[in-house]
Interface confidence: low
């Protein structure tokens, strides 16, 4: 009878999460008599994976019938693999001893490495909105993948971005890995309808990358452009003041009319016109009766957009000298 060899032919076994893994172990001799046990890891802290004689191992089955007299195959199959199952597995031969079995020989070990798919990338934008020409950061996160090699790309409206930084953690050996990437995007006024996409490619995805997206509409604030015009009414003693608020985003906008510093009306933008680029326009009117004015009227329009500081635009309504005289006569 030749000297016992414990043969574990695979040094490396790559398994996808959820699959079954077969760990092969054959022996070349039946001597010395004693059990073959499976362990994960080495040393005193090693974990018992399978013992034919005792214990409950619901996920482990033997490949051949260990009760057969001449059985030399001690291979096992572990079902429903999870990342926690990664590690090096050893089949170990014990000989009988007193009072306990004594370890006789170990196989060289089979490293089980996980093939795990990355989670769907989650893209998050900046905490606060920024205005065009400013740079905002978007973060993409994906986790739970193995092996460590992974490729991440950023796109804006389908065009690849180059200004980003990516980290894969941890740096050393692990059962699974996570990736975090931050892309810097310079905002343009037309970006309300733009999208950034994070694309993750991994060996487990078989050439079909995962994508996560974020809308720049969540990150951008386009401040309005303001225009005030006045139009005399046919009656002659009334003036229509038109206040046009153009190309703003997001929608929330409040407008306050002040006549000589006194609030005469406050309104919240409601009936908006949407532009092709996703920004909005809004028009507000104020009818001013000039017949009972004896001095020039300073009309101020105050616009508060998306909680920002109010922007003022003023217009002076000049009252004619004839009106001033009439008004002066009336007060005497």
């Amino acid at each position: 009878e030749e000297e016992l060899q414990m043969i574990q032919p695979e040094k490396l076994l790559l398994v996808a999460v959820g699959e079954s893994a077969t760990l092969n172990c054959t022996v070349t001799s039946l001597l010395p008599v004693g059990p073959v046990l499976w362990f994960r890891g080495v040393g005193p802290g090693r974990e018992l994976i399978y013992n034919q004689k005792e214990g409950h191992f619901p996920r482990v089955t033997t490949v051949s019938d260990l009760t057969k007299r001449n059985n030399m195959d001690f291979s096992i199959r572990i079902s429903s693999i999870t990342p926690a199952d990664a590690g090096t597995y050893y089949c170990v031969k014990f000989r009988k001893g007193s009072p306990e079995n004594v370890e006789f020989k170990s196989g060289p070990g089979t490293e089980m490495a996980l093939r795990a798919k990355p989670s769907a990338p989650v893209v998050s934008g900046p905490a606060a909105r920024a205005t065009p020409e400013h740079t905002v950061s978007f973060t993409c996160k994906s986790h739970g993948f193995s092996p460590r090699d992974i490729t991440l790309k950023w796109f804006k409206n389908g065009n690849e971005l180059s200004d980003f930084q990516t980290n894969v953690d941890p740096a050393g050996q692990s059962v699974s890995y996570s990736i975090r990437s931050t892309a810097r995007v310079v905002l343009a006024p037309w970006d309300v309808r733009s999208q950034v996409t994070c694309e993750v490619a991994h060996v487990t995805l078989q050439g079909d990358p995962l994508r996560g997206t974020a809308n720049l509409s969540e990150a951008i604030r386009v401040p309005p452009t303001l225009e005030v015009t006045q139009q005399p009414m046919r009656a002659g003693n009334q003036v229509n003041i038109t206040y046009q608020v153009r190309n703003f985003y997001p929608q929330n906008l409040q407008l306050t009319w002040l006549e000589n510093g006194n609030v005469c009306r406050t309104e919240t933008a409601s009936t908006l016109t949407e532009n092709k680029d996703g920004t909005y326009n809004w028009t507000s009117w104020l009818l001013v009766n000039t017949s009972d004015q004896r001095d020039d009227v300073v009309l101020t329009c105050q616009v508060k957009h998306d909680g920002q500081l109010a922007v003022n635009k003023s217009l002076v309504l000049e009252v004619s000298a004839h009106q001033k005289d009439q008004s002066s006569d009336a007060t005497h």
């Epitope: 060899q5 695979e10 490396l12 790559l14 170990s106 060289p108 090699d149 060996v203």
Partner: antibody
């Protein structure tokens, strides 16, 4: 039993490239390493490089062949490929593919492909 | 790279007699798992190489048990207990501890 079947003999001009294929049957292709070993006429065995198909495009190469050899694998057809460029007369050899466990023991060998480099 | 040195270069043998080939590595092939990553291959005339022994002493399935391997660290030996005519060819040792995998120069076994 695993069988590795290689493509046929090639005659090439110096400076050109050659691509040899190796199709595996009768066993799991992806989890094993495919190595390429060459043997010049009357000479010994020389390891060129290897690949574990499941890891995709990651291959390791002997320093001597770095930059001139490219080893690839197609999991869908269980086929490995070895491409050697900038051929010279001393590249005339029989090229073997071999299936190993991890990046070591070569348990199964192809029948070999003779590549002759001659002007 | 690990350098593998084989001896002798040529080995004339008589059928039925034992034969022995030596292989030395430039560094230890003993892995921390306790196994020596040293393989032996035989290339018969006109054929591809075939695996005989792996991990220094494990006999590959289907290989006759007249072949045996021994040794540890840097010195290894392949023994044929009783040479048969079909055993002629070139025997190579190979270290499988690290890449690049490297082979010995070969030992040509021929019948006297």
């Amino acid at each position: 039993q695993v069988q590795l079947v290689q493509s046929g003999a090639e005659v090439k001009k110096p400076g050109s490239s050659v691509k040899v294929s190796c199709k595996a049957s009768g066993g799991t292709f992806s989890n094993y390493a495919i190595s390429w070993v060459r043997q010049a006429p009357g000479q010994g065995l020389e390891w060129m490089g290897g690949i574990i198909p499941i890891f995709g495009s990651t291959a390791s190469y002997a320093q001597k062949f770095q930059g001139r050899v490219t080893i690839t694998a197609d999991e869908s057809t269980s086929t490995a490929y070895m491409e050697l460029s900038s051929l010279r007369s001393e590249d005339t050899a029989v090229y073997y593919c071999a299936r190993g466990v991890g990046d070591d023991t070569l348990t199964d060998w192809g029948q070999g492909t003779l590549v002759t480099v001659s002007s | 790279d690990i350098v593998m040195t084989q001896s002798p270069l040529s080995l004339p043998v008589t059928p039925g007699e034992p034969a022995s080939i030596s292989c030395r590595s430039s560094q230890s092939l003993l892995h921390s798992n306790g196994y020596n990553y040293l393989d032996w291959y035989l290339q018969k005339p006109g054929q591809s190489p075939q695996l005989l022994i792996y991990a220094a002493s494990s006999l590959q399935s289907g290989v006759p048990d007249r072949f045996s391997g021994s040794g540890s660290g840097t010195d290894f030996t392949l023994k044929i207990s009783r040479v048969e005519a079909e055993d002629v060819g070139v025997y190579y040792c190979m270290q499988a501890l690290q890449t690049p995998l490297t082979f010995g120069g070969g030992t040509k076994v021929e019948i006297k």
